[in-house]
């Protein structure tokens, strides 16, 4: 099948620090040596993208400096961390991996990460 | 809104070169590749090369591999093809096109004639 | 090359018929990668659905896709005047990216 499955995971929480991760991973049909990974988050029927980067296969990923997405590379999977979350945030974020080089370019999308935020209470002032 | 604006095409002799360009607005050009696709008269639609993002990665159909050359300049927001050693065979309406989030060619322009 | 095959090559119908057009793939290639475009005389193409069943920005809920494997289908549940067409279907999950060679939908 000429096709490029694309794994991850159903549900993530991120953390009090608005910091949430996850793990994509692809199926490869064949050796790329230049894969791109898009983030996208759909939320309302909307989609906009979050982060991208390109990385050479065996080599870190490597976005923007001012991207909220870091990420490592370990073969066919992708360990992606997006900062900066607030409750707004909350969305369906999917991962795209596209194989970029040597041909033939392959394109896979997979079903998306629903992510909750949820902002943390503020702290009440205390008198010591 | 976006916009993709093709110019350049022309009558042209066979074995002579042409130009063509494809201008874009209302996105961010370099997150996005672009395809050119073209149509014979009363024809089919074929896809015919791509660009992707940086301008560093690039596919071609057989029919013009090693003739047509497409390249971008995001600075300008513009999408080029240069064709040479033109056959007839290569007579059509030139579209330029996204593609979009998703992959599919969610964008076109209006088409440019070469003859 | 996935080589896709359209049938019919044209449709009969007549406003407020179902029409229902057909896309095989010389091979098994995924639905999430599959697009049908409509084109009408003079203009360009424009998205109508992708990934097999969603449809694009701003088209109409009569149009439907579906399908996996090697066939896929679009059906339009009631035909209006503005339908009247010709429709492409598409791969685009690999390269090279490839058209079907057209379904003209035209008025009985």
């Known amino acids: 099948c000429k096709a490029m499955h694309v794994a991850q995971p159903a549900v993530v929480l991120a953390s009090s620090r608005g910091i949430a991760s996850f793990v994509c991973e692809y199926a490869s049909p064949g050796k790329a040596t230049e894969v791109r990974v898009t983030v996208l988050r759909q939320a309302d029927s909307q989609v906009t993208e979050v982060c991208a980067a390109t990385y050479m296969m065996g080599n870190e990923l490597t976005f923007l400096d001012d991207s909220i997405c870091t990420g490592t590379s370990s073969g066919n999977q992708v360990n992606l961390t997006i900062q900066g979350l607030r409750a707004m945030d909350t969305g369906l974020y999917i991962c795209k991996v596209e194989l970029m080089y040597p041909p033939p370019y392959y394109l896979g999308i997979g079903n998306g990460t629903q992510i909750y935020v949820i902002d943390p209470e503020p702290c009440p002032d205390s008198d010591f | 809104q976006v916009q993709l604006v093709e110019s350049g095409g022309g009558v042209v002799q066979p074995g002579r070169s042409l130009r063509l360009s494809c201008a874009a607005s209302?996105?961010?050009?370099?997150?996005?590749?672009i395809h050119w696709v073209r149509q014979a008269p009363g024809k089919g639609l074929e896809w015919v090369a791509v660009?992707?993002?940086?301008?560093?990665?690039?596919y071609y159909a057989d029919s013009v591999k090693g003739r047509f050359t497409i390249s971008r300049d995001n600075s300008k927001n513009t999408l080029y093809l240069q064709m040479n050693s033109l056959r007839a065979e290569d007579t059509a309406v030139y579209y330029c096109a996204r593609a979009g989030n998703w992959g599919p060619f969610d964008s076109w322009g209006q088409g440019t004639l070469v003859t | 090359e996935i080589v896709l095959t359209q049938s019919p090559g044209t449709l009969s119908l007549s406003p407020g018929e179902r029409a229902t057009l057909s896309c095989r793939a010389s091979?098994?290639?995924?639905?999430?990668?599959l697009a049908w475009y409509q084109q009408k005389p003079g203009q360009a193409p424009r998205l109508l659905i992708y990934g097999a069943s969603s449809r694009a920005t701003g088209i109409p809920d009569r149009f439907s896709g579906s399908g996996s494997g090697t066939d896929c289908t679009l059906a339009i549940s009631r035909l209006e005047p503005e339908d009247f067409a010709v429709y492409y279907c598409?791969?685009?999950?690999?390269?090279?990216?490839?058209f079907g060679q057209g379904t003209k939908v035209e008025i009985k």
């Open positions: 660009i992707w993002y940086d301008g560093r990665n690039k």
């Open positions: 598409q791969q685009y999950g690999s390269s090279p990216w490839t």
């Open positions: 209302g996105f961010t050009f370099s997150s996005y590749g």
């Open positions: 091979q098994s290639v995924s639905s999430s990668y």
